[in-house]
């Protein structure tokens, strides 16, 4: 059987290295060798490249080597497949070397900001040594911020033949580290070089970008003063590297700027003690280059009625995220503040908050929250300068079985009844939402019985017990992950009721 006609011929010119063609089929049933016939020097010359019988038979690739690789040039390539039964020729294919040339990657030697030019990096590189000297090269510059996985790209061409070349990358973020990599190709070529080694550069620092500002309103003190915990952080979109030297705060009662008070701090939180009126609070951050835009917050009067518009809220878990969604009756509200903190018996050690715009959901990666911890999540509607009533829910990103079971005691022991009471497990030991409690009880040498009750029940009366019998009992608290038994207690039912009057019969 004749070999199959060689097809899908594909050639690439590795500049000043080789000209390589591949084709299909890659494997033949019977032993096949190939002859690649080339015409070059614009059809003036011809030669062959053989996959010889011994070493490279059945190998669907062949390379032509210097010095017969001329550029620029047009080649024709024809592949002949031969086996014991005869020869099968491919069609003649035509190759313009400029269109299939692959060159070495360029080498970036510096990525630097230019003094006084904001949000720009100047990339300098060396044109690959193995590249045609006179040809226009096209480039793709890939860049990303150092903590991002997503590359952005910009394309450009360079005609000059300087050994080192430059490109000014503009519209970047201030004071941000960028990773750069560059590839190139002759302008007419379909084959790009590999990517250069990555190089890092940092844009110039600027005055701070801005702040996000929030507050926690605490109950008024006995003297009528209200503690307000102010907190702020770099605005979303601010450069990662941005550092503030400090923060200026000023605040005053509404319509009374004469009573303005100012504070300077290097912390990102500050407690104010305000009167019962409406107050306005302003915060700016500053560094050696200037101040950020002003962040503004209105603190409502003590007696102000706040609007309510969140009707319902759901927290659900995806594979790697916690998603909180809410429904609102106010379509005009499109900004929300989300607070989250661990639900612990003591004062929460970590309090987090984030603004959400033009969405009615909030997402957090599971790994940003601790497993087995309950989180309080509150969402506040924000309409211009007014903050509405929050809607709150609780969530675990991962539940476990409780670390301890309920502490249980037996009360009101009767002849056939007993009342069992147990305490709620401390928050720190629940490890999940308590779904229910199960009471396991068993008479000495008897069968075990169980009774399951809702999580809001902390007392249960067992009936139909056997008089004057010893029982062991324990209560199990269960989460979605499973249950944990509390301490085992023992009690004995009475032989006669304490309330029973004894009549002595005289004979």
């Amino acid at each position: 059987v004749l070999p199959a006609k060689p097809e899908n011929i594909s050639c690439i010119f590795y500049y000043e290295e080789n000209f390589t063609c591949t084709w299909s089929p890659e494997k033949e049933a019977s032993y096949t060798w190939y002859k690649v016939k080339r015409t070059y020097s614009y059809g003036y010359k011809s030669d062959i490249c053989s996959t010889d019988n011994s070493t490279r038979g059945n190998h669907a690739s062949c390379s032509f080597l210097p010095p017969t690789i001329t550029n620029p040039d047009n080649y024709t390539i024809q592949v002949e497949a031969q086996n014991a039964d005869g020869i099968m020729k491919s069609d003649i294919t035509y190759w313009n070397l400029d269109a299939i040339m692959k060159i070495e990657p360029p080498e970036i030697f510096s990525v630097k900001s230019v003094l006084g030019i904001k949000r720009m990096l100047q990339i300098k590189w060396i044109r690959p040594v193995l590249a045609p000297h006179s040809s226009t090269l096209k480039y793709t510059l890939r860049f990303r911020t150092i903590n991002s996985a997503y590359w952005m790209e910009v394309n450009f061409t360079k005609e000059d033949i300087d050994r080192d070349e430059t490109y000014n990358l503009t519209e970047l973020q201030a004071f941000t580290e960028y990773v750069m990599t560059l590839r190139c190709a002759p302008a007419e070529s379909m084959f790009w070089s590999g990517w250069s080694q990555e190089k890092v550069g940092t844009t110039e620092e600027e005055a701070p970008y801005g702040l996000d500002l929030w507050r926690v309103l605490k109950p008024a003190m006995v003297d009528g003063r209200r503690p307000v915990q102010l907190m702020w952080k770099k605005a979303t979109g601010a450069p990662v590297l941005e550092k503030a030297l400090g923060y200026n705060i000023w605040y005053f009662p509404e319509n009374n700027t004469n009573l303005t008070e100012t504070v300077n701090t290097t912390n990102q939180t500050h407690e104010l003690y305000l009167g019962g009126k409406t107050y306005w609070v302003y915060v700016v951050s500053y560094n050696s280059l200037g101040e950020s835009p002003v962040a503004t917050l209105r603190i409502p009067a003590l007696n102000e009625k706040t609007f309510q518009c969140i009707e319902a809220m759901q927290a659900c878990l995806t594979q790697d995220q916690l998603v909180v969604e809410w429904q609102s009756s106010a379509p005009e509200v499109d900004t929300w503040m989300v607070e989250w903190f661990p639900d612990v018996d003591s004062e929460p050690s970590s309090f987090s908050w984030e603004s959400v715009s033009q969405a009615r959901n909030w997402t957090i990666q599971k790994d940003e929250l601790k497993p087995l911890w309950c989180y309080n999540i509150s969402v506040y509607p924000v309409l211009r300068d007014r903050v509405g009533q929050p809607y709150s829910t609780q969530a675990y990103v991962q539940e476990g079985i409780p670390s301890a079971g309920p502490v249980t005691q037996a009360d009101s022991i009767g002849v056939k009844t007993v009342t069992i009471t147990w305490k709620e497990i401390p928050k720190s030991k629940r490890n999940g939402f308590i779904k229910n409690y199960t009471i396991f009880y068993q008479a000495e040498d008897g069968k075990e019985f169980s009774k399951t009750v809702n999580s809001n029940i902390l007392q249960y009366r067992l009936e139909s017990l056997t008089r004057r019998t010893s029982y062991s009992l324990q209560v199990m608290a269960s989460t979605n992950a499973g249950g944990t038994n509390g301490t085992k207690i023992n009690f004995k039912t009475l032989s006669i009721s304490h309330h029973h009057h004894h009549h002595h019969h005289h004979h």
Epitope: T39, S41, Y42, Y44, K45, S46, I48, T76, I92
Partner: antibody, heavy 117, light 113 residues
């Protein structure tokens, strides 16, 4: 339509010189190798010389090396053959030919060179 | 240096097929391409077959090219011979040794009757 028009052929004494010209039209002259091919009266064809697209590479048959020079002026679409130290055996019809892929796809009508005392 | 050898003359009858050969003296005929030219008196040559088996669009389909590897020769077949096919036929190949084209001596084809 591709046209190749040769000129410059003449009767010349042995040892003399002659310059042949070939004006091309109907194709992008600078994109193709060009050649001179000769044919002695009643004989076969004989390749004489070829030149690359830009003129940087030239190729000659052994018997004319050092005596003949092929050149081109792409701006004028013209091919030349400078023939020095002519011999009787150089007598032939000289054709200007355009190289295709390993063959000559267009030929001129030829110009006759006679070397005789 | 390889030489392309053609029989000086060949006669064939009208309507039959003429088989013109071009034998390569050294090197494999399969390693390069063979082209064929037709030349009539007082005219320059014109190509009828190039790169082994390709036929210019203006050339009659009765012309075909192939190779006889066992004879190390290029072949020109002219089927259904017509009187206008009477001419000199030259084969040509590229010779890497001389870095240039090489021609065969030519075959004069006569079409009988």
């Amino acid at each position: 339509e591709v046209q190749l028009v040769e000129s410059g052929g003449d009767l010349v004494k042995p040892g003399g010189s002659l310059r042949l010209s070939c004006v091309a039209s109907g194709f992008t002259f600078s994109n193709y190798y060009m050649a001179w091919v000769r044919q002695a009266p009643g004989k076969g064809l004989q390749w004489v010389a070829s030149i690359s697209t830009g003129g940087g590479n030239t190729y000659y048959r052994d018997s004319v090396k050092g005596r003949f020079t092929i050149s081109r002026d792409n701006a004028k679409n013209t091919l030349y053959l400078q023939m020095n130290s002519l011999r009787a055996e150089d007598t032939a019809m000289y054709y200007c030919a355009k190289h295709g892929t390993l063959y000559f796809d267009y030929w001129g009508q030829g110009t006759l060179v006679t070397v005789s005392s | 240096q390889p030489v392309l050898t053609q029989p000086p003359s060949l006669s064939a009858s009208l309507g039959t097929t003429a088989r013109l050969t071009c034998e390569r003296s050294s090197g494999d005929i399969g390693d390069s391409y063979v082209s064929w030219y037709q030349q009539k008196p007082g005219s320059p040559p014109r190509d009828v077959i190039y790169v082994d088996d390709q036929r210019p669009s203006e050339v009659s389909k009765s012309f075909s090219g192939s190779k006889d590897t066992s004879a190390n020769a290029g072949l020109l077949l002219i089927s259904g011979l017509q009187p206008e096919d009477e001419a000199d036929y030259f084969c040509q190949s590229y010779d890497s040794n001389i870095d240039g084209p090489v021609f065969g001596g030519g075959t004069h084809l006569t079409v009988l009757g």
